[in-house]
């Protein structure tokens, strides 16, 4: 949602966090603001304190309930202002009605693990995190590994495109060190976004067997 | 019926105190701000600051600021404005008026009746 | 701060003749949310002021239709489309915009 010179973009983890970024050109100085969260057809309303990430834009997260809990559905509708105080009244600064399972992006996938590990091979599995059971199977996955001498930017994408929470690299070379991330977007939502990519996880190949070509 | 009731006409000697009360009904006292605005005889308005009675937090136009001080008693839903180390020039209507907490169409939408403060030796 | 300038400063008018009042800014009032929080308020003798027009054009609940704001960015005009006699009084713009909010200085609405 744009308001005169504001952006304010805000994404649902599927379960009980709605996390929001409000930008203002000409930022305001000195001045709290927040943003409030009144859904449409539950008791509930909820705030945040609105923090500064950069120059002229801040961030929050409505905590909607505890991490697991399923606290908005496909049909909800939250309307989301942000507000920033004047004097000593509050001023509307932003506005949007929010559909959350339009706007999804969830938590990194967590727990990664090497299951197994070859010389040329190597086989991790992960998790994901607070991701609703709305969802089913309908989920997409996209990793990413991280070779000697290269940057994070250069690692090709591979793409799974079902709920696979595993992976069997291959083509690696013997004795060498990699790292390896994943992220997991879900299939629903017009404005929907890929999570952020997970911590990454460090593992070595094999060493090449001595004597064996 | 909203209402905002002010305190009578006074007239005080310059570097003396005098504090306005605004007494307010026909609406919740604490859900709305109240602005305290002045008008010297034949002049404009000032907005002199406001208070929210919900949890008394003021903001006062820097012009009046040291001098200035709102206050307000939610058991008997009023307000007051008190202004010291007065001066002529402080002569003056000072009104109350009523605003919404949060300002998304205007400032003051109901004013009180006004009180007429003389300041002369 | 923002500084109001009105014009003019009295205004004679003839009854169930339009009146116009013009109000100009020192900067331009449009707030950072997009909004433009100009307001006109009327002072009928010996009374409070009232609320007229507020955010450049909308009428306040119980303004008669004759009273229309216009306007935007550092020009704005309050009309009254015919003049009756209960219009008499000093008419005030005030902006809302940026902190301290500021008054015009009024303009003397009389009939001929």
């Known amino acids: 949602a744009v308001n005169g010179t504001s952006r304010f973009t805000c994404f649902y983890n599927s379960r009980a966090n709605i996390s929001c970024v409000w930008s203002q050109d000409g930022a305001l100085q000195d001045t709290s603001c927040q943003v409030h969260a009144w859904p449409d057809r539950r008791r509930w309303n909820q705030t945040c304190e609105l923090l500064p990430v950069s120059q002229a834009s801040w961030a929050c997260n409505l905590i909607l309930g505890t991490p697991d809990s399923q606290k908005l559905t496909a049909v909800d509708i939250v309307t989301l202002r942000v507000m920033c105080r004047e004097g000593v009244r509050w001023r509307m600064m932003a506005i949007q009605d929010f559909k959350p399972f339009e706007n999804l992006r969830l938590m990194a996938p967590i727990s990664l693990q090497v299951v197994h590990v070859e010389t040329h091979r190597c086989n991790i599995s992960w998790k994901i995190s607070q991701a609703s059971h709305y969802f089913e199977r309908h989920l997409e996955f996209e990793a990413r590994t991280l070779s000697p001498g290269h940057t994070w930017e250069e690692a090709p994408l591979m793409t799974l495109k079902q709920k696979q929470e595993w992976i069997c690299l291959e083509t690696l070379t013997p004795d060498t060190q990699y790292e390896f991330q994943v992220r997991v977007k879900p299939l629903q939502g017009e404005f929907t976004t890929w999570s952020p990519w997970s911590q990454p996880l460090a593992f070595r190949t094999k060493p090449a067997a001595l004597g064996k070509d | 019926e909203v209402q905002l009731v002010q305190s009578g006409a006074e007239v005080k000697k310059p570097g003396a105190s005098v504090k306005v009360s605004c007494k307010a009904s026909g609406y919740t006292f604490t859900d709305y701000v109240i602005s305290w605005v002045r008008q010297a005889t034949g002049q404009g308005l000032e907005w002199m600051g406001e208070i929210y009675p919900g949890d008394g937090n003021t903001y006062y136009n820097e012009m009046f600021k040291g001098r200035v001080t709102m206050t307000r008693d939610t058991s008997i839903s009023t307000a007051y404005m008190e202004l010291s180390s007065l001066r002529s020039e402080d002569t003056a209507v000072y009104y109350c008026?009523?605003?919404?907490?949060?300002?998304?169409?205007?400032?003051?939408?109901?004013w009180g009746q006004g009180t007429t403060v003389t300041v002369s030796s | 701060d923002v500084v109001m300038t009105q014009t003019p400063l009295s205004l004679p008018v003839t009854l169930g003749q339009p009146a116009s009042i013009s109000c100009r800014s020192s900067?331009?009032?449009?707030?950072?949310?997009?909004?433009?929080?100009l307001e006109w308020f009327q002072q009928r003798p010996g009374q409070s002021p009232r609320l007229l027009i507020y955010?450049?054009?909308n009428r306040f609940s119980g303004v008669p239709d004759r009273f229309s704001g216009s306007g935007s960015g550092t020009d704005f005009t309050l009309k009254i489309s015919r003049v009756e006699a209960e219009d008499v009084g000093v008419y005030y713009c005030?902006?809302?915009?940026?902190?301290?909010?500021?008054f015009g200085g009024g303009t003397k609405v009389e009939i001929k």
């Open positions: 900067q331009n009032i449009v707030h950072s949310n997009g909004n433009t929080y």
């Open positions: 005030f902006q809302g915009s940026h902190i301290p909010w500021t």
């Open positions: 008026a009523r605003g919404s907490y949060t300002y998304d169409n205007y400032a003051m939408d109901f």
């Open positions: 955010k450049v054009s």
